[in-house]
Interface confidence: low
């Protein structure tokens, strides 16, 4: 804590200017008016204060705004933002996207800190949903942002926001997350024509059900193997050899290289060897000719 001492004669700050960098900590405490500091926060960033001096300035703002800083101050915090604790940020009410951008810019190039995490949480909660502009901003700064959200949090993303999502934003999403995002993407892109639709929906297909994959197989989409390998195993298993051949088009040759990996391995085990042989890829492990395939799950449902 900085002791309360009287400001030396002639040192009372009239402006936030570069002369303040020569002030000792106690002089900053005594000579800088907190209200002045609040109105001139934009100048603080242009002055090379030491970390210790910034601590004093933060302390002054904390005293002025014990319930949390107003947005007019928050927007101009600049590097002082790095001095804030998550506890401080939990008191804020940030509603402007410009404020959010300004603070994310300060942290640019670094891992997401709990300060930033708390800021984003406060901002999104304040808006009530993850709208397109917010998502655009967050994924620009943190490409992994979307995949860090829980399925419950993703359920608040409106379909209109899906337009802001780039393929790389989904790189680290797991199947549970894609299960939530895929129906939203399907809705968002529903009015596009076949080939354009496939380009947009491709990154989300890890959440697609069997019936949608069957429909895509009728549209000459030529899905690449990387996308196919990310599909849900339970969605791939019911596809016939002919449907997979149509779905992959010229990429069907890639199945051979992936025959030991899911979902290809499990899919092969469900196909008749006769049908697999028609692909001419030498895929092995299908159901031998003459064997009867019983769908036990169907039997159980009937009994």
């Amino acid at each position: 804590e900085v002791e309360k001492t009287a400001c030396p004669s002639g040192k009372k700050a009239r402006e936030i200017d570069e002369s303040l960098i020569f002030y000792k900590k106690w002089e900053l405490e005594a000579c800088v008016d907190a209200a002045l500091l609040a109105t001139q926060m934009d100048r603080v960033n242009a002055i090379p204060f030491t970390y210790e001096q910034l601590d004093v300035l933060k302390h002054k703002l904390d005293e002025l705004y014990p319930q949390g800083y107003p947005e007019s101050v928050i927007q101009h915090l600049g590097y002082l933002f790095l001095k804030m604790s998550p506890e401080d940020i939990r008191k804020w009410n940030v509603t402007s996207l410009e404020t959010l951008k300004a603070l994310l810019e300060v942290n640019k190039g670094h891992e997401m800190s709990p300060q930033v995490a708390t800021l984003i949480d406060r901002f999104v909660k304040g808006r009530g949903q993850l709208d397109k502009d917010t998502l655009d901003t967050l994924t620009a700064f943190y490409p992994g942002y979307l995949c860090s959200l829980s399925p419950e949090e993703l359920s608040s993303v409106p379909p209109s926001s899906i337009w802001a999502v780039r393929p790389q934003d989904l790189d680290t999403c797991d199947p549970r997350q894609l299960d939530v995002l895929y129906p939203k993407a399907r809705l968002a892109f529903q009015n596009m024509n076949g080939s354009e639709y496939f380009v947009k929906i491709q990154s989300f297909l890890g959440g697609a059900p069997t019936e949608d994959l069957k429909a895509l197989s009728q549209q000459n989409v030529s899905m690449d193997l990387a996308t196919f390998m990310k599909l849900r195993t339970d969605a791939v298993l019911p596809l016939t050899v002919a449907e997979v051949q149509k779905l992959l088009g010229p990429h069907v040759e890639g199945l051979k290289a992936e025959e030991r990996h899911r979902p290809v391995r499990d899919w092969i085990l469900r196909q008749r060897q006769d049908d697999l042989d028609t692909l001419g890829l030498g895929l092995q492990g299908g159901i031998p000719n003459g064997y009867l395939v019983l769908d036990l799950s169907m039997q159980e449902a009937l009994s």
Partner: antibody, heavy 123, light 112 residues
Framework: QVQLKQSGPGLVQPSQSLSITCTVS????????VHWVRQSPGKGLEWLGV???????DYNAAFISRLSISKDNSKSQVFFKMNSLQADDTAMYYC?????????????????WGQGTSVTVSS | DVVMTQTPLSLPVSLGDQASISCRSS???????????LHWYLQKPGQSPKLLIY???NRFSGVPDRFSGSGSGTDFTLKISRVEAEDLGVYFC?????????FGGGTKLEIK
């Protein structure tokens, strides 16, 4: 995996200071805060303070005059120093990570703890 | 400081029984924007505490679903639906809504 390893003396003379280092692995101090908590039979679990990822600190007012927490992000180390120890400071001292995912809501619980440093204050 | 009061001090149970521990705070733990930062920890003999439940009712990763938390405001409960031998130890509630963070005195779960 997430680990916090503590190193420090077991025996401290009365009126001397206690220094403990908490070396973390499996996560970055740029992204997570670290709390310090102590446990004694007489007083149970007591929260002493925290250093947040950005380097700012919050201390329990009862200890603020003799407690200092700092860190070196590049070495993944957090440093705890308490001055003027007396017999009633005898306790097990723990460092613990401030819990939460990097991006979604932080939950401000201590999700991973160090093994503890048993400190006896005696001459 | 916020005082956390746990009851009972000791809870003898038979394996397979349900156990219930209560925690009461001296002031509301609802944070200014709605979250309630009340957590539960288990400490086994000779070990560090381990997080079980965070923010009233969320199980930490790896915690079995026989553990559940509930409550609001100032009154909170931890329930174990079917006690197993590995659940024995001292349970602590803790709040992190207000600084300083504070802990309850602990409840020892032991075999009847």
């Amino acid at each position: 995996q997430v680990q916090l390893k503590q190193s420090g003396p077991g025996l401290v003379q009365p009126s001397q200071s206690l220094s403990i280092t908490c070396t973390v692995s499996g996560f970055s101090l740029f992204s997570y805060g670290v709390h310090w908590v102590r446990q004694s039979p007489g007083k149970g679990l007591e929260w002493l303070g925290v250093i947040w990822s950005g380097g700012s600190t919050d201390y329990n007012a009862a200890f603020i005059s003799r407690l200092s927490i700092s860190k070196d992000n590049s070495k993944s180390q957090v440093f705890f120093k308490m001055n003027s120890l007396q017999a009633d400071d005898t306790a097990m001292y723990y460092c613990a990570r401030n819990g939460g995912s990097m991006i979604t809501t932080l939950y401000y619980a201590m999700d991973y703890w160090g093994q503890g440093t048993s400190v006896t204050v005696s001459s | 400081d916020v005082v956390m009061t746990q009851t009972p001090l000791s809870l003898p149970v038979s394996l397979g029984d349900q156990a219930s521990i209560s925690c009461r705070s001296s002031q509301s733990l609802v944070h200014s924007y709605g979250n309630t930062y009340l957590h539960w920890y288990l400490q086994k003999p000779g070990q560090s505490p381990k997080l079980l439940i965070y923010k009233v009712s969320n199980r930490f990763s790896g915690v079995p679903d026989r553990f559940s938390g509930s409550g609001s405001g100032t009154d909170f409960t931890l329930k174990i639906s079917r006690v197993e031998a590995e659940d024995l130890g001292v349970y602590f509630c803790s709040q992190s809504t207000h600084i300083p963070f504070t802990f309850g005195g602990g409840t020892k779960l032991e075999i009847k």
